[in-house]
């Protein structure tokens, strides 16, 4: 049985050239996390797995940064990166646990951070 | 109880446009994400478009993109896929779907409350 959640950074707002950082932590579980996934919509932006460690998509490496933690840092932000974000949770023995995250990248210089939530 | 009907559906040549529409009632449309997926025989459902409640953010995918357009009308709580340059391959169920709320565009299944029945689209010579 599932019982964990992930508890993400949110919708966020950032400025074109900037740069973000994506967190999720998964909570309420005792289960062992093997492996993290990043993704942009279809996209494998990287990997930290908890034997192998980090692997940042080639197509990514000027613009990814791995960490802080499990986190993701986005860099040299264009209007291009808005959309969705989704980190994977490969568990044991729970199985996959999903957060969504959605950023909007900001030609103006008005930026804000949008509260945390909890997906189940 | 919100409810999702699809229609616009049939059987349209290669090349060709059709245009489906998905009538929402029964809840607060213009608060709902709300996407287009397909699926195909014998293969899974997969995501054709996407757009938020306040009709800011789109999202198509790759197969798609240049020849679909996704859209809504608040006023009339419904939804529209307009197809064009119509191909074998988009041969398919459609299925509208609404979430209750949230930010920008959901372009996963898993993010969904609630799916219409479909609309068979099958693009045939």
């Known amino acids: 049985m599932m019982t964990g959640t992930i508890e993400t950074t949110g919708n966020i707002s950032a400025e074109k050239g900037g740069s973000i950082i994506l967190q999720c932590h998964l909570s309420s579980t005792t289960a062992q996390v093997t492996q993290v996934n990043w993704e942009q919509q279809d996209q494998l932006l990287a990997i930290c797995n908890a034997d192998l460690g980090w692997h940042i998509s080639p197509s990514f490496k000027d613009r990814v940064a791995p960490g802080p933690g499990l986190g993701l840092t986005l860099q040299s932000l264009t209007v291009n990166d808005t959309g969705e974000y989704f980190c994977i949770y490969h568990t044991y023995p729970d199985g996959t646990y999903t957060g969504r995250i959605f950023l909007e990248v900001l030609e103006s210089s008005v930026a804000e951070h949008g509260a945390r939530f909890q997906i189940p | 109880q919100v409810q999702l009907v699809e229609s616009g559906g049939g059987v349209v040549q290669p090349g060709r446009s059709l245009r489906l529409s998905c009538a929402a009632s029964?809840?607060?449309?213009?608060?709902?994400?709300m996407g287009w997926f397909r699926q195909a025989p014998g293969k899974e459902r997969e995501s054709v478009a996407a757009?938020?409640?306040?009709?800011?953010?789109?999202y198509y995918a790759d197969s798609v993109k240049g020849r679909f357009t996704i859209s809504r009308d608040n006023s009339k709580n419904t939804l529209y896929l307009q197809m064009n340059s119509l191909r074998a391959e988009d041969t398919a169920v459609y299925y509208c779907?609404?979430?209750?709320?949230?930010?920008?565009?959901?372009?996963?299944?898993?993010?969904?409350?609630?799916w219409g029945q479909g609309t068979l689209v099958t693009v045939s010579s």
């Open positions: 029964g809840g607060s449309f213009s608060s709902y994400p």
């Open positions: 757009i938020s409640s306040d009709l800011r953010f789109t």
């Open positions: 779907a609404a979430r209750e709320s949230g930010v920008g565009y959901y372009s996963r299944a898993q993010w969904y409350d609630y």
